[in-house]
Interface confidence: low
């Protein structure tokens, strides 16, 4: 019995299509597959950013794979051919590994890249990113922001920069059609007459950086002698009611501070007849059913009741 062997895939490479971190891994079939014409060859692909402790592993019959990477670091990948046991009358046969790497050669020292990059998707409608210039960069340094997400033909440059002292320090994005629940890639690079500027790459999903508007129309309703119902309305905009969590802050008679987190637009508060003053504020956040993360809204305007029977009056802001 001769030992069955198979070659690794050929021409294994990582291709950068210019999508700021979304890369193509591609290869060709191994040499000498003639003996296995009736067989479907599979490939085991492993890849990671250099420095990551874990490999991502994919088994595929295709000759390509696509995924997102952090271009601030290098990428390493390896692949081998798998012959299923059906093809070999026995156990699965694996080739040796073919390996490849990819990295963008860094320009400039780390201190020149943008600092404190911060992106917020206001009310799930308007994306705004801001940053600070690198440490000690001169006023002739300018930064440019490029972005891409699946659905765009190519990376686009910001067209509405926020400026300070003539330098770009932020970007107001246009309407981003069908851009949530997928990776959103950003590169901020720069240029200067007297030194190279380090590029920075960022990846996030827009639904995870939403900052909603605060709730509106806060009201009180006395439900019984010892219960008051607090109510409010969701803000205008595209975020559905099912996507909100709320945090309430309640002050009774300027002493007791109650905080609570709720999922509905109401909260029932136990009180005593001696309550002379009641104030509350509410803020909102996208909940775990609609995103993995989010940013609390600003607090609503404060709503207070003072020295009047709550059963006689419902207050609107």
């Amino acid at each position: 019995d001769t030992e069955i062997k198979v070659n690794p895939p050929q021409d294994f490479e990582i291709v950068d299509p210019g999508y700021l971190g979304y890369l193509y891994l591609q290869w060709q079939p191994p040499l000498s597959l003639d003996h296995f014409k009736e067989c479907t060859v599979e490939y085991e692909l492993k890849y990671r950013n250099i420095g990551s402790e874990t490999w991502k592993t994919i088994i595929t019959k295709n000759l390509h794979y696509k995924d997102g990477f952090d271009l601030n670091k290098g990428i390493e990948a390896k692949i081998h051919t798998l012959l299923p046991w059906q093809c070999t009358n026995g156990s699965e046969v694996q080739s040796s590994w073919a390996e490849t790497t990819y990295w963008i050669s860094p320009q400039g020292i780390p201190e020149t890249k943008v600092q404190d990059m911060d992106c917020v998707y206001y009310n799930w409608q308007y994306l705004l990113c801001s940053w600070k210039p690198g440490i000690g960069v001169l006023l002739d340094t300018n930064y440019n922001l490029f972005y891409w997400y699946e659905g765009l033909d190519h990376a686009l440059q910001c067209v509405d920069y926020i400026k300070a002292d003539g330098q770009n320090i932020g970007c107001r994005f246009p309407y981003l059609e069908a851009s949530d629940y997928k990776d959103f890639y950003i590169c901020v690079n720069g240029s200067s007459e007297n030194k190279p500027i380090r590029s920075s790459y960022f990846t996030f999903q827009l639904q995870n950086i939403v900052k909603p508007l605060p709730p509106v129309y806060l009201t009180f309703t006395r439900e019984s002698s010892c219960e008051i119902k607090l109510k409010w309305s969701i803000p205008l905009g595209p975020i559905p009611a099912r996507c909100f969590d709320y945090e309430i802050e309640i002050r009774e008679d300027d002493t007791t501070l109650v905080t609570a987190t709720v999922e509905n637009e109401t909260y029932t508060l136990k009180t005593t007849n001696e309550t002379r003053q009641l104030c509350f504020v509410v803020r909102s956040k996208v909940n775990i059913y609609c995103s993995d993360d989010g940013i609390w809204s600003e607090w609503s305007d404060k709503q207070c009741w003072e020295g009047e029977d709550l059963s006689k009056k419902t207050l609107l802001r």
Epitope: I50, G51, K73, I109, E111, I135, G136, V137, N194, K195
Partner: antibody
């Protein structure tokens, strides 16, 4: 939060070696350098060198170049500093300290490890 | 090696006073338009704490009363209004060239 936890105090004889560890947590280990700084009793601070936790590249103070070795283990986010051919003047507190780029300073420090060299 | 000379080596002051510590480098610590000068505070038995980096940028969470200035060879750390917890030893440190070096320290004591 960022934490750098160093190994315990050591007493060594002249001519021996000491290996101090510094375990990092609360941040992406491979994004930073780790520096080693020592301070003799009642004295000032002396930078010994640093290691890039990502690539393992080292920069040593020439004063210690032949005696110091800095290594890192990315699987445990731990950095090690070994000093050989110890002499009494190596008695000091040894600190690890995290740094990003050169201009960012050393922003988080370990609690320090006292190494006493005495016959 | 770049030598850093701090002055004064000790300083007596009262709570509420303004304190100024200077650090002079034997050669310029500027490069790429950045001053590679940092300031640390150290209390007995504790590791140093970064106050100022790149000559004038505040470390995270440090009170606004600490400020740094200077470029080239001459640098200053200023504490605008001394608080009881500010009495400690202060070090300057350059990170322009290996080996990184520290000043000899300034001990700030209560008058």
């Amino acid at each position: 939060q960022v934490q750098l936890v160093q190994s315990g105090a050591e007493v060594k004889k002249p001519g021996a070696s000491v290996k101090v560890s510094c375990k990092a947590s609360g941040y992406t280990f491979t994004n930073y350098w780790m520096n080693w700084v020592r301070q003799a009793p009642g004295q000032g601070l002396e930078w010994m060198g640093r290691i890039d936790a990502y690539a393992g590249e080292t920069h040593y103070n020439q004063k210690f170049k032949d005696r110091v070795t800095m290594t890192r283990d990315t699987s445990t986010s731990t950095v090690y500093m070994e000093l050989s051919s110890l002499r009494s003047e190596d008695t000091a507190v040894y600190y690890c300290a995290r740094g990003y780029g050169d201009a960012y300073g050393m922003d988080h420090w370990g609690q320090g490890t006292l190494v006493t060299v005495s016959s | 090696d770049i030598v850093l000379t701090q002055s004064p080596s000790s300083l007596s002051a009262s709570v509420g006073d303004r304190a100024t510590i200077t650090c002079r480098a034997s050669e310029s610590v500027d490069n790429y338009g950045i001053s590679f000068m940092n300031w640390f505070q150290q209390k007995p038995g504790k590791p140093p704490k970064l106050l100022i980096y790149a000559a004038s940028r505040q470390g995270s969470g440090d009170p606004a009363r600490f400020s740094g200035s200077g470029s080239g060879t001459d640098f200053t750390l200023t504490i605008s209004s001394l608080q009881p917890e500010d009495f400690a030893t202060y070090f300057c440190q350059q990170s322009k060239e290996v080996p990184w070096t520290f000043g000899g320290g300034t001990k700030l004591e209560i008058k």
